[in-house]
């Protein structure tokens, strides 16, 4: 679903990044994933849209249009108040539920103008309007008062997970696909890779039947699947070659004999 | 196998309405794995995206803005038919007018099509 | 509107030898793990266009195994890899990331 910036600049303050990583360039990393993200460009003082790659990169990418205006933009969170505490409540709030043209199945989130209240509705998958959000907790910023609005739904605590020392964020949101979340996956010392690298093949919600490879943590390689075309998890690579870049670094060999490069 | 015949008058008269139907077999304009769109083909615009319906809960229609106030698709539930209405026509408006039908299952695409409807508008 | 840019607009072929028609998008069509928001189309001459490339790189049934799609971004491609009489006709790639639904202008392709 594509984002449309109708955010006026004029109404947020002084531009002195919030973070310093906000003023780091958009950077790709080095494997050929295609995860549609978000970084704050300096120059233009808005966060837009880039492809990455699915590794490495820096701390300026955010999953969502609206984690890196929070993060990055001076005085966007009081903004976002001021626009969801009645009269200026974004025209998109008042847009009448729409599944889009697609048959995926995607738990998605829009603002109801009978009840005044966020509600859960099942999105396709492709187009639809802009009365759609990621998570109950972004519609009620944005959509109703947030006086009322609780703490963030669904956090995941990803204490579970061995990273490799960055910030790892809760991927079951990535691309704008809500995707069922795959159990925990436990601590696995010989493995210090991206996280989604030891979930599970998951062909998704949809009925196409594509080639598609993940990486096998058990085995260390990558292995063929069907992807059903929507849905699913991070592990998931359009080629093997592509499936064993992002994933194959983190594979430790016999936990002291450095990297299976 | 799906078919779309379509079917209408090939004159219209400049500032009268334009009226096509795409009768369906083999498939149901009430569909919920499916929508129904036309589509118009000019030497000067190519391939113009005019508008859609799909049911899911209830019926949805989007349509393109350059033809937004004077078209409306309707579906025919009894006939198992669609249907373009496109008031005041110009000119600019001759082309060749397809029925398609967007596959929302598995492909996510335009498979099916009507065989075309050349309407020149003149008086 | 997202515009599609297609070239060459006019693709002279000779029968056996491969084809490449490329498509750019004004914006990503990328939509999560490699799917992408993207059609191709043929218009066989006298003829209603056919669905040949659904979601970027899917062959619809029916579509032989010589013609492929792949890109990713803004920038996509459909190769024929041995072209044959029968491929002659224009094609278009259709994205469908946001309306209004758009099509490229159409590449031609002609045996030489």
């Known amino acids: 679903l594509s984002e449309e910036a109708d955010d006026t600049d004029s109404e947020l303050g002084s531009m002195k990044p919030l973070h310093t990583f906000c003023a780091m360039k958009a950077d790709d990393g080095p494997c050929k994933a295609m995860i549609r993200s978000y970084f704050f460009n300096m120059y233009t003082h808005q966060c837009e849209e880039f492809i990455y790659g699915g590794c490495e990169g820096n701390e300026n990418r955010f999953d969502t249009l609206e984690e890196c205006k929070k993060t990055c933009i001076p005085g966007y969170e009081k903004t976002a108040v001021k626009a969801a505490s009645g009269a200026e409540r974004p025209d998109f709030c008042f847009l009448e539920e729409d599944p889009g043209l697609c048959r995926g199945y995607m738990k998605r989130y829009l603002y109801n103008n009978q009840t005044k209240q966020c509600e859960r509705f099942v999105y396709g998958g492709c187009l639809g309007n802009r009365n759609n959000f990621e998570t109950l907790d972004e519609c009620k910023k944005i959509c109703e008062n947030p006086v009322h609005s609780p703490s963030p739904v669904n956090e995941v605590q990803m204490s579970d997970y061995v990273t490799d020392g960055n910030t790892v964020t809760d991927r079951s949101t990535v691309n704008n696909i809500v995707v069922p979340q795959s159990p925990k996956v436990p601590r696995r010392r010989d493995y210090r890779g991206r996280p989604w690298c030891l979930q599970p093949a998951d062909s998704g919600l949809c009925k196409a039947s594509e080639r598609r490879f993940y990486y096998n943590s058990a085995t260390g390689k990558c292995h063929r699947f069907n992807y059903t075309g929507c849905g699913g998890n991070n592990n998931n690579f359009t080629t093997r070659r592509r499936c064993l870049r992002s994933c194959k670094t983190g594979l430790i060999k016999n936990k002291s004999k450095g990297v299976v490069k | 196998q799906v078919q779309l015949q379509q079917s209408g008058p090939g004159l219209v008269k400049p500032s009268q309405t334009l009226s096509l139907t795409c009768a369906i077999s083999?498939?149901?304009?009430?569909?919920?794995?499916?929508?129904w769109s036309w589509i118009r083909q000019s030497p000067g615009r190519g391939l113009e995206w005019l508008g859609i319906i799909y049911k899911r809960s209830k019926w949805y229609n989007r349509y393109a803005v350059s033809v937004k106030s004077r078209i409306t698709i309707n579906p025919d539930t009894s006939k198992n038919q669609f249907s373009l209405q496109l008031n005041s026509v110009t000119p600019e408006d001759t082309a060749v007018y397809y029925c398609?039908?967007?596959?929302?299952?598995?492909?996510?695409?335009?498979?099916?099509w009507g065989q075309g409807t050349l309407v020149t508008v003149s008086s | 509107d997202i515009v599609m840019t297609q070239s060459p607009l006019s693709l002279p072929v000779t029968p056996g030898e491969p084809a490449s028609i490329s498509c750019r998008s004004s914006?990503?069509?990328?939509?999560?793990?490699?799917?992408?928001?993207l059609n191709w189309y043929l218009q066989k001459p006298g003829q209603s266009p056919q669905l040949l490339i659904y979601k970027g790189s899917n062959r619809a049934s029916g579509v032989p195994d010589r013609f492929s799609g792949s890109g990713s971004g803004t920038d996509f491609t459909l190769k024929i890899s041995r072209v044959e009489a029968e491929d002659v006709g224009v094609y278009y790639c259709q994205q469908y990331d946001s309306y209004p639904l758009t099509f490229g202008q159409g590449t031609k392709v002609e045996i030489k």
């Open positions: 083999g498939d149901s304009v009430s569909s919920d794995s499916a929508a």
């Open positions: 914006q990503s069509l990328v939509f999560s793990f490699g799917t992408t928001f």
């Open positions: 398609a039908r967007w596959h929302s299952d598995k492909m996510w695409g335009f498979d099916d």
